[in-house]
């Protein structure tokens, strides 16, 4: 038994252009937390295993708020170590999966929203009881710096925490009823002494006098990073004389990387860059499986159908993202029309409508006309949530209650006299003029300049009474039409008001649930 310990030193934008300024979205402040998952790295059964060695979740880091125009600082991180206890032997070779999560603290209905910022997956060799191993990993535009170690918990000792030890003073046999604790050492042993000068940071040993290097380091004392080797770029078997590599077939020939991984050459070897969900030397191991519970917010995890994904998350209502980590801001799509207030209840969306509107998305315009009908034969016109009256001639104002003087604007031309009438106005034209507004001059021979135009009505014209009779019939027809329209509107509004009362009751119940 023992404990794997992970210390995050820094998480922030990586070097180079296009690096993000802030981990937070535009919606406001956020804070970071980390998840670590450990898997044994050699056995074939690890391919579909959960975090078999254990997993841990860090505390939340301090709240981070981006300062506009300020240089991006080191992001505030959670305090303390991430500790993953392991019950059995430490496997030595293992896979380390570190996820950096962002918790958004903006005004989220239903609580904070999480999103996965970065995931690094590395296969590592590490002896228990050794020094801290440091690492820097890139994940997209982010860079993560961390240290890790595995340590045994007494009485377990050794590089795999499999040997048990006891102090000299302890009795040499197990107590009555207990089976032997083999292999039991005579005393607590010190870890093996490595070769003199072996790097404490990048080397370790399982036998006294040896110096074995962690991944990324080479040389007899594990002091040389592999990327600075003078033989970089050369291929083939090792030369015994120079220690350099001589040309030969490329390690990436035939692409040894499985599951769509891409191969890049390293001195004398190769490295696979694996697609999401896979890891291992050849991307042959599925990194995160459904048994790890990768779907947040209760999402249903299903084994991926295509080779590029180890799993697919089917999200609960109100969540999205490859891990169901994003709360769906469905109100940002402005589904409520006519100024309605959008409420995202998590599992459903509700619109609280402004007065005069109804329907699931406030799409029905009740327009208030029925409640405040237009007077004096005015017609109500719907639109924009505010009713508008188109008034009959001779009336004006918001509800057509004010009597208008149609002659106030002096509409009769060429000295014609204006008479206000319930159906509008009538111009009595001066001699020599004709037309509805006395706009046409009459020629000396009695022919109008526009013979098609009807003559203006003068007081005493025999046509006048007939025209007025026609107008009266038209007005009566309009008034009758308005009465029918108002009655039908009242019925329709009553129906929607009933529906709206029911909907508001439901909404109140849901919000209180």
């Amino acid at each position: 038994a023992g404990v794997f310990e992970l210390q995050i030193h820094s998480f922030g934008p990586g070097p180079g252009p296009g690096a993000p300024r802030s981990p937070c979205s535009a919606r406001g402040p956020c804070r970071l937390f980390f998840r670590v998952c450990l898997k044994p790295g050699l056995s074939e059964e690890a391919a579909e295993s959960p975090c078999a060695l254990g997993a841990a979740l860090s505390a939340r880091g301090p709240v981070y708020t981006e300062q506009p125009e300020a240089p991006a600082p080191d992001l505030p991180l959670p305090n303390g170590l991430l500790q993953v206890p392991f019950r059995d032997a430490w496997p030595g070779t293992f896979s380390l999966i570190i996820e950096t999560w962002r918790e958004e603290l903006g005004d989220q209905i239903g609580g904070p929203a999480w999103s996965l910022l970065a995931r690094v997956t590395r296969r590592r060799r590490l002896a228990a009881g050794g020094p801290w191993a440091r690492d820097i990993q890139r994940a997209g535009a982010w860079e993560l710096r961390f240290s890790y170690r595995a340590r045994c918990e007494l009485p377990a000792v050794g590089t795999a925490c499999t040997r048990l030890c006891r102090p000299r003073s302890a009795p040499s046999r197990c107590g009555p009823g207990l089976r032997p604790c083999a292999p039991l050492e005579d005393e607590c042993e010190a870890p093996p002494v490595c070769r003199a000068g072996c790097s404490l940071e990048h080397g370790f040993c399982e036998q006294p006098g040896e110096c074995r290097c962690l991944e990324g380091w080479t040389g007899p004392l594990c002091m040389v990073p592999v990327s600075t080797s003078s033989c970089l770029g050369l291929r083939g078997p090792s030369s015994t004389t120079t220690g350099c590599l001589v040309p030969g077939p490329g390690p990436c020939d035939g692409n040894p990387c499985a599951n769509g991984g891409s191969c890049s050459e390293t001195p004398g070897s190769f490295e696979c860059t694996c697609p999401r969900g896979f890891y291992g030397l050849r991307c042959e191991v599925s990194g995160v499986t459904c048994a790890d519970g990768p779907c947040f917010n209760g999402g249903l995890c299903v084994g991926g159908a295509d080779p590029d994904s180890a799993y697919i998350c089917h999200c609960p209502p109100g969540f999205q993202g490859s891990n169901c980590e994003k709360r769906v801001d469905r109100c940002s799509l402005q589904p409520c029309r006519n100024g309605g207030l959008c409420l995202d209840l998590g599992h459903a969306l509700r619109c609280r409508c402004r007065a005069g509107f109804a329907g699931p998305r406030c799409e029905h315009d009740l327009d208030d006309c029925a409640g405040r009908a237009c007077a004096n034969g005015g017609t109500c016109v719907e639109g924009g949530g505010a009713h508008r009256c188109s008034c009959a001639l001779g009336f004006g104002g918001r509800n057509c209650r004010e009597r208008a003087d149609p002659c106030a604007a002096r509409p009769c031309a060429h000295g014609g006299r204006c008479y206000a009438h319930f159906s509008g106005l009538v111009c009595a034209c001066a001699p020599g003029y004709m037309g509805a507004r006395c706009e046409f001059p009459v020629h000396p021979d009695g022919v109008s300049a526009l013979p098609a135009a009807p003559p203006g009505l003068r007081p005493g014209d025999p046509q006048r009474a007939g025209v007025i009779a026609v107008i009266v019939v038209v007005v009566i027809a309009i008034v009758a039409g308005i009465v029918v329209l108002v009655i039908s509107r009242k019925k329709r509004m009553a129906k929607y008001e009933k529906a709206e009362i029911k909907e508001m009751g439901e909404m109140h119940r849901e919000l209180n649930a």
Epitope: L57, A291, D292, G293, G298, P316, P317
Partner: antibody
Framework: EVQLVESGGGLVKPGGSLRLSCAAS????????MNWVRQAPGKGLEWVGQ??????????HYAESVKGRFTISREDSKNTVYLQMNSLKTEDTAVYYC????????WGQGTTVTVSS | NIVLTQSPATLSLSPGERATLSCKAS??????VSWFQQKPGQSPRLLIY???NRYTGIPARFSGSGSGTDFTLTISSLEPEDFAVYYC?????????FGGGTKVEIK
């Protein structure tokens, strides 16, 4: 292989208490929402309650029929979720299952609770 | 709570026949419907999620369809091991609710 194993069921008198346990293996337990669902004899399924994750402050939700009487808790270090049932009624007689997630993907084999005088 | 009504209550069929089970919701639940199979003395098992998606390891003879308020589970050709009780469940509105079940028995 994912396994959920319920225990703690038995015969209890009305008004009595019982504590059910559900031990999980084969999954990273701390990442899963856990639910209790029950099935009265010869009847259908009824959701009882749910507990979420540490990152959700172990939020719990309950069916109206058990609210105030039943309490769900979890111990991630032991891969175990519990259902504490108090003030039991005869209508609580059922097989109790623990299930995972929002969609009840993994199920235990169930434990029988009989409330009778 | 949303009420799910399953029909028929019992379906008597022979192996090899096609089974069609219905589930109606009291209100719109989108496609947030799952189907579960329960054999005597066993726990329920998830078959279909999201109205029409087969869960991991479920044979292709099981298919689901529908959206809104009307949903159907179809077993294209009944195998002896398919005779069981089938429940629909809605996951659109919290709390989740189940239908009363349809028993598929051997004729």
């Amino acid at each position: 292989e994912v396994q959920l194993v319920e225990s703690g069921g038995g015969l209890v008198k009305p008004g009595g208490s019982l504590r059910l346990s559900c031990a999980a293996s084969g999954i990273t337990f701390s990442n899963f929402w856990m639910n209790w669902v029950r099935q009265a004899p010869g009847k259908g399924l009824e959701w009882v309650g749910q507990i979420r994750l540490k990152s959700d402050d172990y939020a719990t939700h309950y069916a109206e029929s058990v609210k105030g009487r039943f309490t769900i808790s979890r111990e991630d270090s032991k891969n175990t979720v519990y259902l504490q049932m108090n003030s039991l009624k005869t209508e609580d007689t059922a097989v109790y299952y623990c299930t995972t997630g929002y969609y009840f993907d993994y199920w235990g084999q169930g434990t029988t609770v009989t409330v009778s005088s | 709570n949303i009420v799910l009504t399953q029909s028929p209550a019992t379906l008597s069929l022979s192996p090899g026949e096609r089974a069609t089970l219905s589930c109606k919701a009291s209100e719109n639940v989108g496609t947030y419907v799952s189907w579960f199979q329960q054999k005597p003395g066993q726990s329920p098992r998830l078959l279909i999620y999201g109205a029409s998606n087969r869960y991991t390891g479920i044979p292709a003879r099981f298919s689901g369809s529908g959206s809104g308020t009307d949903f159907t589970l179809t077993i294209s050709s009944l195998e002896p091991e398919d005779f069981a009780v089938y429940y629909c469940g809605q996951f659109y509105s919290f709390p989740s609710t189940f239908g009363g079940g349809t028993k598929v028995e051997i004729k």
